[in-house]
């Protein structure tokens, strides 16, 4: 008597999550009677898929009709696959009796899972940092499956290289996560630069996602002071200017500082962007030469973005007042405070 | 090549817990059963139980009210929990894989730690 | 529990010769689909166990052809065609039918 044989033909399927898997299964004969089951996973700690004569299975379905008299067509088909129904599933002919005896099983079939990545996540630094310092950004991405995945970041469109990816778990398992740092190095233009980061998958059909950060929360461009003293006015009043340029955030605050003594405090708002998305702010103080006997030094203190204050001084001579003691600057001005403090 | 490596404390003092970590490199956690056996000084190897991919728990009767094993295949670990020892539960441990074959039986434990000596005592 | 037991427990070896080793269940190791759940384990001194023979007589993966199993049943030998030096150590026989797995209480082998 020719032994029966359980032939499960395909030693792997792939099925896209939400779509319905067919799993091949027949036998080389009739004899002896008894049921065929399906189970994922093998040994003590299987589960029972497909029972076709008995239970409740609301996912899996004969393909062909099993109470057909001389069925030999054991196929099953399971619906909305999750990527939680992946494994290695075998189907098994038992010989009728109390208890019915396993006999034989297939050689088992692999069901594996594609799954989409999900929208790719990424974050910045946690604190800024200025221009020629290195940040790292990290991306994550989960649920996918099969694990192979290509991960790419791009500054302004240019690939980044200094890049480490990590897919795990490094085994076999229903889905995947990726997760990879980029170190970024800033420059003072890079206000208005953007890091993406691209994921493409075999279940994204050439359409790869992409999550983006603005290097704009990563970096703080510190401002360049200029403190300068116009004209004298023939009421013998001097207009010094401090030019606080290319700084970024906005956030600002201006102290003057006469002979050490606070003059004015002030704080930048609603300043309008340079091309490069830093601001500059110009702030004026008019001194009264006539009311000092001595020279008065003015500084201007710079407290950027909760960092230590930067300080510029200027010392107003007193002794002779020529018409000219300083000239105008070129920088942009970009907001004006005069006030007479006499 | 599938290597196991156990970590944990190699003193226990009597009533506490045993916890033991099998970090599983070079393969996959999927389709295998992932095995604690020990063997106390001297003697012969003594099976405690094991954990399938799917989360399925198998423990020697003698050793349930006391044993959990779990996995945590984002590590690609599995732990053993012992609770109450006692200086008896002394023994070097072993994590292991066993193969699984198509049939309801199993396909030999083909793969071992190291071992880990744990001592109770006070 | 599946009982196994082993017999000799001590085995002086002649390198060159051949050895052998019983083993024997308390029930039978035999499935009903044909396949045998009886393993050979040998573990040197100071070493991990390492698995020598799965399904009573299939050799694993880069072990020697001198190791041979056979049996059926309850009853399984494991036969070494010539002992070599470094085949000392203590060799265990066990089921994977049914849980809990369990081991024979191991035969010592060592050079006489």
């Known amino acids: 008597e020719e032994e029966l044989q359980v032939i499960q033909p395909e030693k792997s399927v792939s099925v896209a999550a939400g779509d319905s898997a067919t799993l091949n299964c027949t036998v080389s004969s009739l004899i002896p009677v008894g049921p065929i089951q399906w189970f994922r996973g093998a040994g003590p700690g299987r589960e029972l898929i497909y029972n076709l004569k008995e239970g409740h299975f609301p996912r899996v379905t004969a393909v062909s009709d099993p109470t057909k008299r001389n069925n030999m067509d054991f196929s099953i088909r399971i619906s909305n696959i999750t990527p939680a129904d992946a494994g290695t599933y075998y189907c098994v002919k038992f010989r009728k009796g109390s208890p019915d005896v396993e006999l034989k099983s297939g050689a088992g079939t692999e069901l594996s899972v594609r799954a989409k990545p999900s929208a790719p996540v990424v974050s910045g630094p946690a604190v800024r940092a200025t221009a020629e310092h290195t940040v790292s950004f990290t991306c994550e991405s989960h649920g996918f499956s099969p694990r192979d995945i290509t991960l790419k970041w791009f500054k302004n469109g240019n690939e980044l290289s200094d890049v480490q990816t990590n897919v795990d778990p490094a085994g076999k398992s229903v889905s995947y996560s990726i997760r990879s740092t980029a170190r970024v190095l800033l420059t003072r233009r890079d206000v208005h630069s953007q890091v993406i980061c691209e994921v493409a998958h075999v279940t994204l059909q050439g359409d790869p996602l992409r999550g983006t950060a603005n290097l704009s929360e990563a970096i703080r461009v510190p401002p360049f002071l200029e403190v300068t003293q116009q004209s004298m006015r023939a009421d013998n009043q001097v207009n010094v200017t401090c030019q606080v340029t290319k700084f970024y955030p906005q956030r600002l605050q201006l102290t003057w500082l006469e002979n050490g003594n606070v003059s004015r405090t002030e704080m930048a708002s609603a300043l309008p962007e340079n091309k490069d998305g830093t601001y500059n702010w110009t702030s004026w103080l008019l001194v009264n030469v006539s009311a000092h006997r001595d020279d008065v030094k003015l500084t201007c203190q710079v407290e950027h973005d909760g960092q230590p204050a930067v300080n510029k001084s200027f010392s107003v001579k007193v002794s002779a007042h020529p018409k000219e003691q300083g000239s105008n600057t070129a920088a942009e001005n970009t907001g004006t405070n005069e006030r007479n403090i006499y | 090549q599938v290597q196991l490596q156990e970590s944990g404390p190699g003193l226990v003092k009597p009533s506490e817990t045993l916890s033991l970590t099998c970090t599983v490199s070079?393969?996959?956690?999927?389709?295998?059963?992932w095995s604690w056996i020990r063997q106390p000084p001297g003697k012969g190897l003594e099976w405690i139980g094991f954990?399938?991919?799917?989360?399925?728990?198998f423990y020697q009767s003698s050793l349930k009210s006391r044993v959990t094993i779990s996995l945590d295949t984002s590590k690609n670990q599995f732990s053993l929990k012992m609770t109450s020892v006692t200086a008896a539960d002394t023994a070097v441990y072993y994590c292991?894989?066993?193969?699984?074959?198509?049939?309801?039986?199993?396909?030999?434990?083909?793969?071992w730690g190291q071992g880990t000596t744990v001592t109770v005592s006070s | 529990d599946i009982v196994m037991t082993q017999s000799p427990l001590s085995l002086p070896v002649t390198p060159g010769e051949p050895a052998s080793i019983s083993c024997r269940s308390s029930q039978s190791l035999l499935y009903s689909t044909g396949y045998t759940y009886l393993d050979w384990y040998l573990q040197r001194p100071g070493q991990s166990p390492q698995l020598l023979i799965y399904?009573?007589?299939s050799r694993a993966s880069g072990v020697p052809d001198r190791f041979s199993g056979s049996g059926s049943g309850t009853d399984f030998t494991l036969k070494i065609s010539r002992v070599e030096a470094e085949d000392v150590g203590v060799f265990y026989c066990g089921q994977a039918l049914q849980t809990p797995l369990t081991f024979g209480q191991g035969t010592k082998v060592e050079i006489k």
């Open positions: 954990i399938y991919y799917n989360g399925r728990t």
């Open positions: 399904g009573g007589s």
């Open positions: 070079g393969g996959s956690i999927r389709d295998y059963y």
């Open positions: 292991a894989r066993v193969r699984a074959y198509s049939g309801i039986g199993l396909d030999g434990t083909d793969v």
